[in-house]
């Protein structure tokens, strides 16, 4: 769920998601449209696709709570939970490390980016 995601992103990136990423660019945060603005925004667009696929599978992406361990900078998703919980954890783990990989190109100007400026073709999944 959303609490899992926030905690994981903070642990991996060291940033407070609510202050740094939700929202950011055209795809980080709720919803998303248009061409991603940078690599960080692409992370979120890919994550949206990951969630969309799990929605198709009937997973409750915002409500399902999963278990994971964070140690020595790595995330280990529990294999004890349901398939949906494991996949949700995998989606969130991927976006957390994607955001971390792209910290060096993070642009403060894209924080609270005005969504009507998000133009162009929304990438397909």
């Amino acid at each position: 769920g959303i609490l899992n995601l926030n905690k994981m992103v903070k642990q991996v990136t060291g940033k407070m998601p609510i202050l740094s990423y939700w929202p950011y660019g055209c795809h980080c945060g709720l919803g998303g449209r248009g061409q991603p603005k940078d690599a960080t925004d692409w992370c979120c667009q890919t994550h949206d696709c990951c969630y969309d696929h799990l929605k198709t599978q009937g997973c409750s992406i915002y409500k399902d709570y999963y278990r994971y361990n964070f140690s020595q900078g790595n995330i280990h998703c529990s294999d004890k939970g349901s398939w949906c919980e494991q996949q949700l954890c995998a989606c969130d783990k991927e976006v957390a490390f994607c955001l971390k990989r792209n910290l060096d190109t993070y642009q403060k100007r894209l924080r609270f980016y005005w969504r009507p400026h998000c133009r162009g073709q929304t990438p397909g999944c």
Partner: antibody, heavy 118, light 111 residues
């Protein structure tokens, strides 16, 4: 244990509507999608659509968009499918089914045979 | 919509032998390391029963003589050794995208 209870039969006249029920028990009704599947006599299975009881979010197979309407009553843990403008082509067994983990159907109702006849 | 083509439409297998049922999808149902193909058994007058999910995972309580394999567009359900109680119609179903669709079914008869 998980149960999805459906009435055995519904006899309706051509042009009329019918509301098929599916009462769930043995699990938290609002947590999982409820699906509806049609099976004409001697034929295969067709997915009609699904509804999430927590917020009534629905997805329909376009083929059934104008034929079926899915609703839920959370207070009684019951899902409904209304079929309108019935013709003999709609005579079939209608199943409700729920998926607990991914979009494969773990639990099924016994099915309701809808017969459209004058 | 993804079309699932099952073959054969019917088959007769001797007790203790192997039954092989094929399901071919009109486009790939595999992505992100999973194949979104599932198998059901249906006996007359009963609802379908889940046998295999995600191409090869055995549903709890289903005998180990049932197995599934495949990826992309080609999938197989194997039953070995076949028992009398396996006489039924078998359906594949995908969940790669909406709408979900089923194969046309394969009727298994035990000789």
């Amino acid at each position: 244990q998980v149960q999805l209870q459906q009435p055995g039969t519904e006899l309706v006249k051509p042009g009329a509507s019918v509301k098929v029920s599916c009462k769930a028990s043995g699990y938290t009704f609002t947590r999982y999608w409820m699906h509806w599947v049609r099976q004409r006599p001697g034929q295969g299975l067709e997915w009609i659509g699904r509804i999430h009881p927590s917020d009534s979010d629905t997805n329909y197979n376009q083929k059934f968009k104008d034929k079926a309407t899915l609703t839920v009553d959370k207070s009684s843990s019951t899902a409904y499918m209304q079929l309108n403008s019935l013709t003999s082509e709609d005579s079939a067994v209608y199943y409700c089914a729920s998926n607990w983990d991914g979009a494969w159907f773990n639990y099924w109702g016994q099915g309701t045979l809808v017969t459209v006849s004058a | 919509d993804i079309v699932l083509t099952q073959s054969p439409a019917s088959l007769a297998v001797s007790l203790g032998q192997r039954a092989t049922i094929s399901c071919r999808a009109s486009k790939s149902v595999s992505t992100s390391g999973y194949s979104y193909m599932h198998w059901y058994q249906q006996k007359p007058g009963q609802p379908p029963k889940l046998l295999i999910y995600l191409a090869s995972n055995l549903e709890s309580g289903v005998p180990a003589r049932f197995s599934g394999s495949g990826s992309g567009t080609d999938f197989t359900l194997n039953i070995h050794p076949v028992e009398e109680e396996d006489a039924a119609t078998y359906y594949c179903q995908h969940s790669r995208e909406l709408p979900f669709t089923f194969g046309s079914g394969t009727k298994l008869e035990i000789k």
